[in-house]
Interface confidence: low
């Protein structure tokens, strides 16, 4: 018969013949022959393959380090990789979490939208009119402007989204 | 200069209570969030607590979440660290620090030097 040019899925060609490939969790160890199957090993402990695959090598399992504010927050199987996350207080810099930052402050004319998470840095948004936050923070949301008239006082000075409005003594009509 | 003094470590038995403090001098305190941090011997940093400028917010850690309280005493430069039913695994050396203001890419601006808190029978 004609040689394969071409193997069924979970099968690889090689010397002219189809091998099956190793499962996910296991290495190649050698090739299949005319007379021999595939001879597939298990990963070695904190190793993995997460496909059908002809990978003499497992991949290493991430390293969580905790100096980069990591921890696991999913143990790696032969199968998987370790997930990381940050501890308590930090967040992701990017979706592979590969290493972490302090929550960002929300500078000086913005508030805090949304307190950050484990996975989620803060949310900042603009102070709208008639609030303000004149400093940076992670926790502090945009403060109402104090309201003179209920103090029986006037505006001397307008607020801003970071400066809060400055009251004074009503004018006294002379008589 | 910045300055973080921390103090109050010690020995303390498994069930004890310790009060941490933590004096700051060389910026503006109250506008300042500030934050307990801890190294466990051989281990990472592991944040402990939080707090706003005013001490109006506090956050925790879940491993002390209960137990320790998280204070500040703006008049006196100072924050606080109340621990009460302490466990072997909250032997640590402690650290207070200043938050940065621009966090992007540092976790801390100021550290304090660390006060060992040693839990044991």
């Known amino acids: 018969p004609e040689p394969p040019t071409a193997c069924r899925e979970k099968q690889y060609l090689i010397n002219s013949q189809c091998c099956s490939l190793c499962q996910p969790g296991q290495k190649l160890v050698s090739d299949c022959t005319e007379f021999t199957e595939t001879e597939c090993l298990p990963c070695g402990e904190s190793e993995f393959l997460d496909t059908w695959n002809r990978e003499t090598h497992c991949h290493q399992h991430k390293y969580c380090d905790p100096n980069l504010g990591l921890r696991v927050q999913q143990k790696g199987t032969s199968e998987t990789d370790t997930i990381c996350t940050c501890e308590e207080g930090w967040h992701c810099t990017s979706e592979a979490c590969e290493s972490c930052v302090l929550h960002r402050s929300c500078s000086p004319g913005f508030g805090v939208k949304q307190i950050a998470t484990g996975v989620s840095d803060t949310i900042c948004e603009p102070c709208p009119v008639g609030f303000f936050s004149n400093v940076s923070s992670a926790f502090e949301k945009c403060h109402p402007w104090t309201s003179c008239e209920t103090k029986d006082l006037v505006v001397q000075q307008a607020g801003t989204n970071k400066t809060d409005v400055v009251c004074g003594p009503q004018d006294r009509l002379r008589a | 200069e910045v300055q973080l003094l921390e103090s109050g470590g010690g020995l303390v038995q498994p069930g004890g209570s310790l009060r941490l403090s933590c004096a700051a001098s060389g910026f503006t305190f109250k506008t300042s969030p500030m934050y307990w941090v801890r190294q466990a011997p051989g281990k990472g940093l592991e944040w402990v607590s939080s707090?706003?400028?005013?001490?109006?917010?506090?956050y925790y850690a879940d491993s002390v979440k209960g137990r320790f309280t998280i204070s500040r005493d703006n008049s006196k430069n100072t924050l606080y660290l109340q621990m009460n039913s302490l466990r072997a695994e909250d032997t640590a050396v402690y650290y207070c620090?200043?938050?940065?203001?621009?966090?992007?890419?540092?976790?801390?601006?100021?550290w304090g030097q660390g006060t060992l808190v040693t839990v044991s029978s």
């Open positions: 707090i706003d400028r005013t001490g109006g917010h506090t």
């Open positions: 620090a200043k938050q940065a203001l621009l966090t992007d890419a540092k976790r801390f601006d100021y």
